[in-house]
Interface confidence: low
């Protein structure tokens, strides 16, 4: 028996359902009583789901997995993972044994989009050219870790005096806070771009400092 899976990682958004595709080619006369199917975490060998002795043995992994029972006899051994969490990320191995045995691994990459950044300025009044200001760009609830880029009004990257921190909440999602310290020119626009490297999603925020008032 030959097991086939997607070579590309499966990308799943947090709280959505994901299908980890796995298939085999059944011989003529194949019956489910002959099938032993096991899904497990590749690295730790933890059992996720199994089908043995002619029946679905159910989920061994937080009760959020399911097979496609009507499609098994056609060679579809795919696994449905419901309400995906950050902790589900990783490699899953599909083992199929009929008379002989084969296995293959498929990777699950979890992702969550970042919110539109909010911009704050300190100090936020009585600003004059030559003043040092601190601009903070905050974006929330994304995954995996963000890449943060700063640019001035002409699109020139600002790399000096940038400090970025990312904190995970109890669900494993990241809040990113990036701080730019800059000396004010006469007029200036400062833009922050928060990029999700998996989704290739960019979230933009900017602040324009003129004489007054401030524009966000």
């Amino acid at each position: 028996v030959e097991v086939q899976v997607s070579e590309d990682p499966v990308v799943a958004l947090v709280d959505t359902d994901a299908t980890l595709r796995c298939s085999f080619s059944p011989e003529p006369g194949f019956s489910l009583a002959q099938l032993n199917l096991i899904w497990q975490l590749t690295d730790t060998k933890q059992l996720v789901h199994s089908f043995t002795e002619g029946r679905d043995q159910g989920s061994a992994y937080s009760n959020r997995t399911a097979l496609f029972p009507d499609l098994l006899v056609q060679g579809n051994a795919s696994l449905r993972l419901q309400r995906v969490r950050v902790t589900d990320e990783g490699s899953y191995t599909c083992f199929v044994s009929i008379q002989d045995f084969d296995s293959a691994a498929v990777s699950l990459q979890v992702a969550a989009p970042y919110s539109k950044p909010s911009m704050t300025l300190e100090p936020n009044k009585d600003l004059r050219p030559g003043n040092m200001v601190t601009i903070t760009c905050s974006s929330y609830q994304g995954y995996p870790e963000a890449e943060v880029f700063w640019k001035d009004g002409q699109g020139v990257p600002l790399t000096g005096n940038v400090t970025t921190s990312q904190m995970a909440n109890e669900r494993g999602l990241f809040d990113v806070h990036s701080v730019l310290r800059v000396v004010l020119g006469a007029n200036g626009t400062y833009s922050c771009l928060v990029r999700n490297p998996v989704l290739q999603q960019d979230a933009h925020g900017s602040v324009t400092i003129t004489g007054q008032p401030l524009t966000f």
């Epitope: 690295d43 730790t44 990320e89 990783g90 990459q109 995954y143 995996p144 870790e145 963000a146 890449e147 921190s165 990312q166 904190m167 995970a168 109890e170 494993g172 490297p197 998996v198």
Partner: antibody
Framework: DVQLVESGGGVVRPGESLTLSCAAS????????VSWVRQAPGEGLEWVSG???????YYADSVKGRFTISRDDSNNTLYLQMNSLRAEDTAVYYC??????????????WGLGTLVTVSS | EVVLTQSPGTLTLSPGERATLSCRAS??????LAWYQQKPGQAPRLLIY???TRATGIPARFSGSGSGTEFTLTINSLQSEDFAVYYC??????????FGGGTKVEIK
């Protein structure tokens, strides 16, 4: 088989620099997070720095601004550039792999470590 | 940062006895806790992660329990190869990732 092999340790004077390397095999270094963890003689473990699969870098406060973590994907190698070394940086430095793309996790594989001694 | 406090500092036991090691977090880390074993001159070795899950190849005599701020590593029927230093590590609130100070399990 997953393997991590550190090198580059040695004896340096306070204020000097050193670069540690960690050659990884058995996995692709940009598909996992990898960290540096150190252990001073007779002491416990201290996380120093980590880099996620997507290249985001983090540092312990004790080394921020002095140490730089980086990697060379083509050579599957992790680096730790250590500047302005102090006596308290003396330790065995371990390279450790997280079992996920993001580094905020436990470490399932460790190297054997390389000893850095900072002494005048 | 989350501070992990391990107790006791040293545990002196005979082979065949049960070892109970404690790790206390300064604030809740849910179940994001791992345990490592380290022998002299060797790198740490992962034993337990997510508080209760044994790593690949770890014998069933090692078990973990707890949640929130109180965690326990239990080694049933100590074998000669189990005498080592044990560290807990949290990965819930970071940076930084933090380790406990260690518990040495030594032969009586």
């Amino acid at each position: 088989d997953v393997q991590l092999v550190e090198s580059g340790g040695g004896v340096v004077r306070p204020g000097e620099s050193l670069t540690l390397s960690c050659a990884a095999s058995g996995f692709t270094i940009n598909s996992y997070a990898v960290s540096w963890v150190r252990q001073a003689p007779g002491e416990g473990l201290e996380w120093v720095s980590g880099i996620s699969g997507s290249g985001v870098r983090y540092y312990a406060d004790s080394v921020k601004g002095r140490f730089t973590i980086s990697r060379d994907d083509s050579n599957n190698t992790l680096y730790l550039q250590m500047n302005s070394l102090r006596a308290e940086d003396t330790a065995v430095y371990y390279c450790a792999r997280s079992n996920k793309v993001t580094w905020n996790n436990f470490f399932d594989y460790w190297g054997l470590g390389t000893l850095v001694t900072v002494s005048s | 940062e989350v501070v992990l406090t391990q107790s006791p500092g040293t545990l002196t036991l005979s082979p065949g006895e049960r070892a109970t090691l404690s790790c206390r977090a300064s604030r809740s880390i849910l179940t994001s806790l791992a345990w490592y074993q380290q022998k002299p001159g060797q790198a740490p070795r992962l034993l337990i992660y997510n508080t209760v899950t044994r790593a690949t190849g770890i014998p069933a005599r090692f078990s973990g329990s707890g949640s929130g701020t109180e965690f326990t590593l239990t080694i049933n029927s100590l074998q000669s190869e189990d005498f080592a230093v044990y560290y807990c590590q949290q990965y819930y609130d970071w940076p930084p990732l933090t380790f406990g100070g260690g518990t040495k399990v030594e032969i009586k």
